[in-house]
Amino acid sequence: IIDGAPCARGSHPWQVALLSGNQLHCGGVLVNERWVLTAAHCKMNEYTVHLGSDTLGDRRAQRIKASKSFRHPGYSTQTHVNDLMLVKLNSQARLSSMVKKVRLPSRCEPPGTTCTVSGWGTTTSPDVTFPSDLMCVDVKLISPQDCTKVYKDLLENSMLCAGIPDSKKNACNGDSGGPLVCRGTLQGLVSWGTFPCGQPNDPGVYTQVCKFTKWINDTMKKHR
């Protein structure tokens, strides 16, 4: 997260980290006791999922292995359209004050809405500095018309843009798949942006979760 600050303790109990061994790979969100939602470009063969602590490496955190993941069938490695994936935990997460399910959206939030993006990704770019504590930054949803002025035909209609004019505030590497939460509901998953991260007036691009609630529910039901 660029130009952010540590999240208020316990304010993001649905936030998870997907680890490869002990190394941060991506962010994600807990949908229920068995399922994590993340970005399709975060696909690996096996995951270790960190839940229940804002601090990576915290021994009090839950660590659960996951071996099954289901990319959206329409994901494209060229255009990154439909950049979302469900990861099935090998054992159930224990819900607590620090481990809660995210609220999936019942509607798409409009441009101008203030949202929070969070993650353990690098806080500097191109030099990398990985924090141990979960970082947050507030950004505003940007209309597709305004975002298309920047990204032209790279922008697909299930992509959501967010940023702050003339500001560096943005996600970065390691934040992929993590949540963009607006008014208490999950509206986006970190998908992509320009490099180095945090270039003013280059919005972050997110998978627009409100367009995929049916696929999320159907996929969890299908692979119970």
Partner: antibody, heavy 127, light 108 residues
Framework: QLQLQESGPGLVKPSETLSLTCTVS??????????WVWIRQPPGKGLEWIGS???????YYNPSLKSRVTISVDTSKNQFSLKLSSVTAADTAVYYC???????????????????WGQGTTVTVSS | DIQMTQSPSSLSASVGDRVTITCRAS??????LNWYQQKPGKAPKLLIY???SLQSGVPSRFSGSGSGTDFTLTISSLQPEDFATYYC??????????FGGGTKVEIK
């Protein structure tokens, strides 16, 4: 300003292993979110990608060379290296090291352009 | 593997001419296409990345366009220092990263 410099023997015998090193100055190889790349150019021919390594040590190889190639990083010396085994005359080329600049973060981080190059070193395979 | 086909393989032009080089990918590569200039005995130099973005320090007479499978490098007014070989390069999600065969721009 980042600079790259290739070094290694200019002559290698057939069936032996070619070993080259690229020394990076003006930036730390282990803390920069870039790819570190090896490319070669046979005499009078075009460019061929050999492989790449990122700051975390993940490697990516050209499938046509994969069985013979190893790329590694020595962070203490700020270097990355290339080993190409069982060489033949067809491996005679100018070998370049380069920095791969990602075209974005997240899903666009896997794509890159080589924005800084070494000057190249000529390797001849001959007995 | 994705094949990159450049045309023409060589061309002769005069100072001040507008020069266009094309690069075609065997399948869609979105905008993940970069252009390089190489002079004899020198390393390649990045000119254009992401199909149309001008690399810092490169003169504005160079421009790139295209998306999907067809891409173009244009030199609006050829200068003496532009006589060189030009390569396109696609940056893939899966290896290998591949280059076009090159276009040699010579003095007419």
């Amino acid at each position: 300003q980042l600079q790259l410099q290739e070094s290694g023997p200019g002559l290698v015998k057939p069936s032996e292993t070619l070993s080259l090193t690229c020394t990076v100055s003006g930036g730390s190889i282990s803390s920069l979110d870039y790819y570190w790349v090896w490319i070669r150019q046979p005499p009078g021919k075009g460019l061929e990608w050999i492989g790449s390594i990122d700051y975390s040590g993940d490697t990516y190889y050209n499938p046509s060379l994969k069985s013979r190639v190893t790329i590694s990083v020595d962070t203490s010396k700020n270097q990355f290296s290339l080993k190409l085994s069982s060489v033949t005359a067809a491996d005679t080329a100018v070998y370049y090291c380069a920095r791969g600049r990602p075209l974005g973060y997240g899903a666009r981080h896997y794509y890159y352009a080589m924005d800084v190059w070494g000057q190249g070193t000529t390797v001849t395979v001959s007995s | 593997d994705i094949q990159m086909t450049q045309s023409p393989s060589s061309l002769s032009a005069s100072v001040g001419d507008r020069v266009t080089i094309t690069c075609r990918a065997s399948q869609s590569i979105s905008s993940y296409l970069n252009w390089y200039q190489q002079k004899p005995g020198k390393a390649p130099k990045l000119l254009i990345y992401s199909a149309s973005s001008l690399q810092s320090g490169v003169p504005s007479r160079f421009s790139g366009s295209g998306s999907g499978t067809d891409f173009t490098l244009t030199i609006s007014s050829l200068q003496p220092e532009d006589f060189a070989t030009y390569y396109c390069q696609q940056s893939p999600y899966f290896p290998p990263l591949t280059f076009g065969g090159g276009t040699k721009v010579e003095i007419k």
